[in-house]
């Protein structure tokens, strides 16, 4: 099946201090390689989460990525702050015979808009 990375929401709004889910699904797990979440693009992009076992404070996977044939690579960001605002991309990499892995597909991005916490 042809690989497609889908981020269904163009944007989500979340109040500061709350948590939000950023959805990402794949149509295929092939080719073999990791899925990573970034905020921003190009040189200034920031790694937010990687489905490779590292620990990322405040960011967790929504479903069990270790389950066989799991296609859901959504993440939850907890205790959102204004600094979390930006566009988040779910990116699929192909594992190379040697590093680094090659980016092969990305979701269209989800803009996170952080609202002031209601007083």
């Amino acid at each position: 099946k042809e690989l497609k990375v889908t981020q269904p929401e163009k944007s989500v709004s979340v109040a500061a201090g709350d948590s939000t889910v950023l959805n990402c699904t794949l149509t295929s797990l092939l080719p073999v390689g990791p899925i990573k979440w970034y905020r921003g693009v190009g040189q200034s992009r920031l790694l937010i989460y990687s489905f490779t076992g590292e620990h990322f404070p405040r960011v967790t996977n929504v479903s069990d990525a270790t389950k066989r044939n799991n296609m859901d690579f959504s993440i939850r960001i907890s205790n959102v702050t204004p600094e979390d605002a930006g566009t988040y991309y779910c990116v699929k990499f192909q594992k190379g015979p040697s590093e680094p892995d090659t980016e092969i597909q990305s979701g269209g991005g989800t803009e996170v808009y952080v609202l002031a916490k209601p007083s």
Epitope: K10, S13, Q105, G108, G109, Y113
Partner: antibody
Framework: DVQLVESGGGVVRPGESLRLSCAAS????????MNWVRQAPGEGLEWVSL????????YYADSVKGRFTISRDNSKNTLYLQMNSLRAEDTAVYYC????????????WGLGTLVTVSS | ETVLTQSPGTLTLSPGERATLSCRAS??????LAWYQEKPGQAPRLLIY???SRATGVPDRFSGSGSGTEFTLTISSLQSEDFAVYYC??????????FGGGTKVEIK
């Protein structure tokens, strides 16, 4: 049928203000993000501003930030662009454009309204 | 921001000929690219989105291809109504949404 009709263009002096309107019909206006795109005489298309369906997410091009204000009235199916401190370089045809529901490309455009800033 | 460069600036062809328009991105936009047609006095019209998907009602002589940083719009056999200005637009890196400078297809 989707229809977008811009109005409010005209000739103004530098430093003056103008308010553009875009009347929308043929779709559920409040469900779609809307944009203003402009085209200076003999030039290409330039994105100006974006507002989400609910009105809570707003972005501007750097060239108009602090001078232009985008807004919408979902009860009237109308998009607005308040343009203050106008400059000669703001002279352009201003188009109202409806975004696709999933991605930030424009599936429908209006015919545009001409704004001329001249002393 | 992602800069889009279109070439050539002007393409002079005869009806029935094949037109090939190029759009190059300064960084990868994957397949998040659209093409529009603009004619004087008319609203711009969406032709292609997702780099290769034709919008509703667009004739099949229009086709898009490419991914990453290199994209092409092809008009297989030019009709009189196809002489216009064509713009590419990326919607991967946003905002700002950016357009190419346009390619004018004119009659020889």
């Amino acid at each position: 049928d989707v229809q977008l009709v811009e109005s409010g263009g005209g000739v103004v002096r530098p430093g003056e203000s103008l308010r553009l309107s875009c009347a929308a019909s043929g779709f559920t206006f409040s469900s779609y993000d809307m944009n203003w795109v402009r085209q200076a005489p003999g030039e290409g298309l330039e994105w100006v501003s974006l507002i989400s369906g609910s009105g809570e997410i707003i972005y501007y091009a750097d060239s108009v930030k602090g001078r232009f204000t985008i807004s919408r009235d979902n009860s009237k199916n109308t998009l607005y662009l308040q343009m203050n401190s106008l400059r000669a370089e703001d002279t352009a045809v201003y188009y109202c454009a409806k975004e696709n529901n999933r991605y930030r490309f424009f599936d429908y455009w209006g015919l545009g309204t001409l704004v001329t800033v001249s002393s | 921001e992602t800069v889009l460069t279109q070439s050539p600036g002007t393409l002079t062809l005869s009806p029935g000929e094949r037109a090939t328009l190029s759009c190059r991105a300064s960084q990868s936009v994957y397949t998040y690219l659209a093409w529009y047609q603009e004619k004087p006095g008319q609203a711009p019209r969406l032709l292609i989105y997702g780099a290769s998907s034709r919008a509703t009602g667009v004739p099949d002589r229009f086709s898009g291809s490419g991914s990453g940083t290199e994209f092409t719009l092809t008009i297989s056999s030019l009709q009189s109504e196809d002489f216009a200005v064509y713009y590419c637009q990326q919607y991967y890196d946003r905002p700002p949404l950016t357009f190419g400078g346009g390619t004018k297809v004119e009659i020889k």
